[in-house]
Amino acid sequence: FERTRSLQDPCSNCPAGTFCDNNRNQICSPCPPNSFSSAGGQRTCDICRQCKGVFRTRKECSSTSNAECDCTPGFHCLGAGCSMCEQDCKQGQELTKKGCKDCCFGTFNDQKRGICRPWTNCSLDGKSVLVNGTKERDVVCGPSPADLSPGASSVTPPAPAREPGHSPQ
């Protein structure tokens, strides 16, 4: 089968890192500088990604795999394969078209990326606010007044996965 296939297509035996070179009577040639082929049987090699500007090289290009980029300090990756770099903000801020802006009252962001989210509404769960929220931190909900019988002291931080304002199903 291998012999039959290679008679039909001389390119099928070209390994990753080479290409089937029409200029050389379809024999396998090594990929040229700054290019790669990650699979066998390729008729061209792909140009290596170049990590320039705000991108920096996380993994060099080789003849069989593309370069991988990440972002310079102060920026973070967005998109598949780090296709974009977005500016970091401080905790308590979000990135807008005009740059980093503090979270509005009643919202918080505990990361250097993403948007400000509303504080958890403790009363929706029948609970009280134990620790007030800040720009950087969500509120901490405490037990409901009915739970405050002697000897009971269960402090429940809000579940981070639940969307604010929604009560459990």
């Epitope: 890192g17 070179d21 200029n23 050389r24 040639s29 090594p30 040229p32 500088p33």
Partner: nanobody, 121 residues
Amino acid sequence: AVQLVESGGGLVQPGGSLRLSCAASGSIFSIYAMAWYRQAPGKQRDFVASITSGGSTIYADSVKGRFTISRDNAKNTTYLQMNSLKPEDTAVYYCNSLGSWDGERYEYDYWGQGTQVTVSS
């Protein structure tokens, strides 16, 4: 131009080893890659292994783990160490040098005269 002279071929038993050498002379400063190919009677010339000026190596699947390509810059020589040889490795082995890439093709493409490798008991 680049001149290439291969040596080291011969008759060897299955499971044996050989080391082929390819000595380059001439305009060797412009070599981007050195490669070994082989051609059995009535077959096309097949890629075996290559090594670039940066030291990156590539092997055909059929020889991976058995053959090793290397080079000695001081001697302008490229080697192909062949271990665990099989009868199907029998072929004429050719050394090839490729010049720099001009965007569409390699600027030059030189071949040695070939050296016969026969694997037989």
